[in-house]
């Protein structure tokens, strides 16, 4: 189960001066993600930093049991045993992929 959250922040400005930049980037980037630069290892506290080609921003693929923009929160999602015809009910959890704006 993957959730994506987007947070809008000030201080960022789009680089739209040169349209050819965007075209070149899209042409050259066929894969969805490339690794962040190595010095960004600290961007995700409990997870892997990825650079999303489509989103044009860093994102975190959180380790199991963690969530949040920087995988900084413990994920307490659990499997509940529910009486009745439905034996198991899934509540949240899973692999979280958070994008940073």
């Amino acid at each position: 189960n993957t959730t994506t959250t987007t947070k809008s922040e000030d201080g960022h400005y789009a680089r739209t001066d040169y349209a050819e930049n965007a075209n070149k980037l899209e042409e050259s980037a066929r894969e969805h993600h490339i690794p962040c630069p190595e010095h960004y290892n600290g961007f995700c506290m409990h997870g892997k930093c990825e650079h999303s080609i489509n989103m044009q921003e860093p994102s975190c693929r959180c380790d199991a049991g963690y969530t949040g923009q920087h995988c900084e929160k413990k994920d307490y999602s659990v499997l509940y045993v529910v009486p009745g015809p439905v034996r198991f009910q899934y509540v949240g959890g899973g692999s979280h992929h958070h994008h940073h704006h």
Epitope: D10, R15, P37, N41, F43, M45, Q56, E57, H70, E72
Partner: antibody
Framework: QVQLVQSGAEVKKPGSSVKVSCKAS????????ISWVRQAPGQGLEWMGG????????NYAQKFQGRVTITADESTSTAYMELSSLRSEDTAVYYC?????????????????WGQGTLVTVSS | EIVLTQSPGTLSLSPGERATLSCRAS???????LAWYQQKPGQAPRLLIY???YRATGIPDRFSGSGSGTDFTLTISRLEPEDFAVYYC?????????FGQGTKVEIK
């Protein structure tokens, strides 16, 4: 507009320490990597290390490992670089720099914003 | 660490001429993580090109970057008086981040 403002020039004795500050304004501070780069007189640029304030994790160039400490205070949007056991070869202009990734159609992790530089002179 | 070697060390040209600056890496560098900076005396460096070929905001189109792998080039198509400065390449995909030693573009 993002601005990085550094502390003033310092004159230090060999063997002592110096702590240079870099205050960010005009944008989000916590999630950007802040680097420290130095430039000795007439020389090129040398990356010392940096930090992502949100995590507090710093990493350093091996040359400076054990002698440099980079920290950040999210509450004041200020990054610090402390260099110890100073020697004359540490005389340089020290810059803080921030990357400039954006939510635009193209992006960069290169150093888009720079402080004005802080001259540190090490002399007996 | 990745060593970046720039050539030539100094380039003596006249305004209006074309400048070609080279940056060679000791091992392959991702094109996503190669930048060029301009620095004038007494000033902080200024980002010109990132991702090997993308101009930073506000940079005139006479500046262009190209290359891949271990060989990268910064070209200034027609030198203006304000372009005479020192130029540095930088790789920022691998830690430690490294810079080339610089190329000085001076007036002939």
């Amino acid at each position: 507009q993002v601005q990085l403002v550094q502390s003033g020039a310092e004159v230090k004795k060999p063997g002592s320490s110096v702590k240079v500050s870099c205050k960010a304004s005009g944008g989000t501070f916590s999630s950007y990597y802040i680097s420290w780069v130095r430039q000795a007189p007439g020389q090129g640029l040398e990356w010392m290390g940096g930090i992502i304030p949100i995590s507090g994790r710093a990493n350093y160039a091996q040359k400076f490992q054990g002698r440099v400490t980079i920290t950040a205070d999210e509450s004041t949007s200020t990054a610090y670089m402390e260099l110890s056991s100073l020697r004359s070869e540490d005389t340089a202009v020290y810059y803080c720099a921030r990357d400039g990734y954006s939510s635009g159609r193209s992006t960069t992790y290169a150093f888009d914003y720079w402080g004005q530089g802080t001259l540190v002179t090490v002399s007996s | 660490e990745i060593v970046l070697t720039q050539s030539p060390g100094t380039l003596s040209l006249s305004p209006g001429e074309r400048a070609t600056l080279s940056c060679r890496a000791s091992q392959s560098v991702s094109t996503y993580y190669l930048a060029w900076y301009q620095q004038k005396p007494g000033q902080a460096p200024r980002l010109l090109i990132y991702g090997a070929s993308y101009r930073a905001t506000g940079i005139p189109d006479r500046f262009s970057g190209s290359g891949s792998g271990t060989d990268f080039t910064l070209t200034i198509s027609r030198l203006e008086p304000e372009d005479f400065a020192v130029y540095y390449c930088q790789q920022y995909g691998h830690s430690p981040i490294t810079f080339g030693q610089g190329t000085k573009v001076e007036i002939k």
